[in-house]
Interface confidence: low
Amino acid sequence: SASSRRRQQSRNRSTQSQDVARVSSASDYNSSELKTACRKHELYVSFQDLGWQDWIIAPKGYAANYCDGECSFPLNAHMNATNHAIVQTLVHLMNPEYVPKPCCAPTKLNAISVLYFDDNSNVILKKYRNMVVRACGCH
Amino acid sequence: SASSRRRQQSRNRSTQSQDVARVSSASDYNSSELKTACRKHELYVSFQDLGWQDWIIAPKGYAANYCDGECSFPLNAHMNATNHAIVQTLVHLMNPEYVPKPCCAPTKLNAISVLYFDDNSNVILKKYRNMVVRACGCH
């Protein structure tokens, strides 16, 4: 019956209290493209390289990091995927030309404190929000 | 003097209270690739197309939407870029092989309510978080 079919489907699908069930994968790679899955990469940014060395006193640079990697089917638990990303992945699987894969983006960002010269050449200590990537996910 | 130089710079520059100043652009396109800038696109998702019609009673589908487009230099104000994305864009500008551009991802997500059958074939009304894209930005 339809009822028993639904129960069978329910047993087969993993449930989560808050999210649409994720399809898990043991692999950290998308085998078809051999590109690593979405993750945080280390990146040190020098303020001199950005041309900002004359107004930023300290630090000279900082560990900004960045996100990169595939958000391919199946999304694994490490990918911190939103419900929308899970839906989008399935839509992309069926219509790859129509809808892109979700993208690998920061899920946690931290601030850094910067010592700099203001408009009147006063030395100011200020916290700049969302400067450091702490975690990445599929969005 | 360095002090007067800084004052002169300050007269020429636009400042922002919370964020690293964004470089604005009137264009919604990255001229080199002719791809539109990061924005929200409309997308209706049918639960039948996803194969979920036997456990989701209502709705039959929903306006999920998705994000797509370029996060290229210069980032304009409509791109809701984080400070990190601004920094990453500049690093990519100087080292395109080393660091990717920021990606176009949801900045605002809404929930939807779904009526479905649980494991015991009970009818449940549940709110699923982060299902609908309301806004996109460069992250």
Epitope: L50, W52 | Q8, N12, R13, S14, R22
Partner: nanobody, 130 residues
Framework: EVQLVESGGGLVQAGGSLRLSCAAS????????MGWFRQAPGKERDFVAA????????YYTASVKGRFTVSRDNAKNTVYLQMNSLKPEDTAVYYC???????????????????????WGQGTQVTVSS
């Protein structure tokens, strides 16, 4: 007041080279950061390259890095853009611009900001044929 006059544009085949020059009038040339921008038909004006007051710092957009070289001669009040390995997509009007930015100035008014530049030349056409 600074006046800028570009020269050196023209028609060149893909893979070829051109050297653009920008001559500045006035004795304050060395107090300006100099930039090159370009505008293709029907498109916005885009940043290409910039050089600091002293010539010690140079900046490039990703699509030209490794192919174009920006430099300046403060004794001659001239800034140059050496363009090698030209591609059809480099076709545009190229503008020279002068602005009072430092190599270490703030985001929003540094080498990449069009608003940073106070003075602009009339432009020189570069056409790259395939």
């Amino acid at each position: 007041e600074v006046q800028l006059v570009e020269s050196g544009g023209g028609l060149v085949q893909a893979g070829g080279s051109l050297r653009l020059s920008c001559a500045a009038s006035g004795r304050t040339f060395s107090s300006y950061g100099m930039g090159w921008f370009r505008q293709a038909p029907g498109k916005e004006r885009d940043f290409v390259a910039a050089v600091s007051k002293s010539g010690g710092s140079t900046y490039y957009t990703a699509s030209v890095k490794g192919r174009f070289t920006v430099s300046r001669d403060n004794a001659k009040n001239t800034v140059y853009l050496q363009m090698n390995s030209l591609k059809p997509e480099d076709t545009a009007v190229y503008y020279c611009a002068a602005g009072r930015w430092e190599s270490g100035s703030r985001p929003g008014s540094t080498w990449y900001g069009e608003r940073t530049y106070d003075y602009w030349g009339q432009g020189t056409q570069v056409t790259v044929s395939s």
